[in-house]
Amino acid sequence: ATKLTEEKYELKEGQTLDVKCDYTLEKFASSQKAWQIIRDGEMPKTLACTERPSKNSHPVQVGRIILEDYHDHGLLRVRMVNLQVEDSGLYQCVIYQPPKEPHMLFDRIRLVVTKGFSGTPGSNENSTQNVYKIPPTTTKALCPLYTSPRTVTQAPPKSTADVSTPDSEINLTNVTDIIRVPVFN
């Protein structure tokens, strides 16, 4: 079998994973997209998914995971904030296209989270501490039935962060070194 390619990210606890999954094809723009973890010997498990149909430049938060789908650019932005050692593992982005099998987006992400905070910001984060407020309203994620249902928090209408992020207006509490969201949204 062909070995799927992986991109490795080594980060410290408390930092943020901030990656892009390219799908390029316009036909996938409105398709629902998901972030999955792949554990040895198990089926991929969906951790978060976009709405169906997926909205342009509209952040969706599931716990510490934030997904933003940029239709104009054919890419899904995935952020996992306040990383923990136990977040280490293999991840992938997929596009749901029922009744067909999900379409996997390359490359898979091999995340390695280690203990101890590094004072020097990594390549995917900065040293500014953003203080966010999690919006009170939640809705059920409309992820396919064969995955675990998750609670999705929609982005609030306006960020109360001390440093405003370009597209996402999701705010989290007690999170350090959050990469500020791309303004392209």
Epitope: K20, P157, V183, F184
Partner: antibody
Framework: EVQLVESGGGLVQPGGSLRLSCAAS????????MDWVRQAPGKGLEWVGR??????????EYAASVKGRFTISRDDSKNSLYLQMNSLKTEDTAVYYC?????????WGQGTLVTVSS | DIQMTQSPSSVSASVGDRVTITCRAS??????LAWYQQKPGKAPKLLIY???NLQSGVPSRFSGSGSGTDFTLTISSLQPEDFATYYC?????????FGGGTKVEIK
């Protein structure tokens, strides 16, 4: 045709006001964040501000240099973006572009020149 | 604010040359960087988004690389229509900021 067309530029005295418009066509305007970017004569590009899309409640962001003086608004029913500029200063003299984001402006207007001078 | 420092500010080159422009962010911006080309009297044109994604319709001689704080735009073989000013822009956080520009001139 997918395009953006700005209008409303002109000569205005310091302290005066001006309203720029940007007419969009060929795409679903309400789905997109829209920005204003300006360029002073012979200078580089400067981001002015953004109005987010309908899904993000049309919230706005501004550069510090224009905050409190400039207001960005939009009318999705008219596929139009606006920039209301008050208390204009000579340093606001520039070509103003409207642009569609967000991860890079793939669509720009042709620009409209605003000259602030006494 | 995130400062974007572009270098060089100008470069003289000949048709067929390989040209490299660099852009450095004052703090990490992940992959959220765009490159534009602008010709006199015209609006900028998007070349690269998300650091390395080539915008549709842009010739493959243009390429982008980098992440975090250091980014590069490369023109593999300069063509006559490539003489212009190039700008980088960070899209990671507000306020959005541009580099000062690099003018590519004919040697």
């Amino acid at each position: 045709e997918v395009q953006l067309v700005e209008s409303g530029g002109g000569l205005v005295q310091p302290g005066g006001s001006l309203r720029l418009s940007c007419a969009a066509s060929g795409f679903t305007f309400s789905d997109h964040h829209m920005d204003w970017v300006r360029q002073a004569p012979g200078k580089g590009l400067e981001w002015v501000g953004r109005t987010r899309n309908k899904a993000n409640s049309y919230t706005t962001e501004y550069a510090a240099s224009v905050k409190g003086r400039f207001t960005i608004s939009r009318d999705d029913s008219k596929n139009s973006l606006y920039l209301q500029m008050n208390s204009l200063k000579t340093e606001d003299t520039a070509v103003y572009y409207c642009a569609r984001g967000p991860l890079g402006y793939k669509l720009w207007g042709q620009g409209t020149l605003v000259t602030v001078s006494s | 604010d995130i400062q974007m420092t572009q270098s060089p500010s100008s470069v003289s080159a000949s048709v067929g040359d390989r040209v490299t422009i660099t852009c450095r962010a004052s703090q990490g911006i992940s992959s959220w960087l765009a490159w534009y080309q602008q010709k006199p009297g015209k609006a900028p044109k998007l070349l690269i988004y998300a650091a390395s994604n080539l915008q549709s319709g842009v010739p493959s001689r243009f390429s982008g690389s980098g992440s975090g704080t250091d980014f590069t735009l490369t023109i593999s073989s300069l063509q006559p229509e490539d003489f212009a000013t190039y700008y980088c822009q960070q899209a990671n956080s507000f306020p959005l900021t541009f580099g000062g520009g690099t003018k590519v001139e004919i040697k």
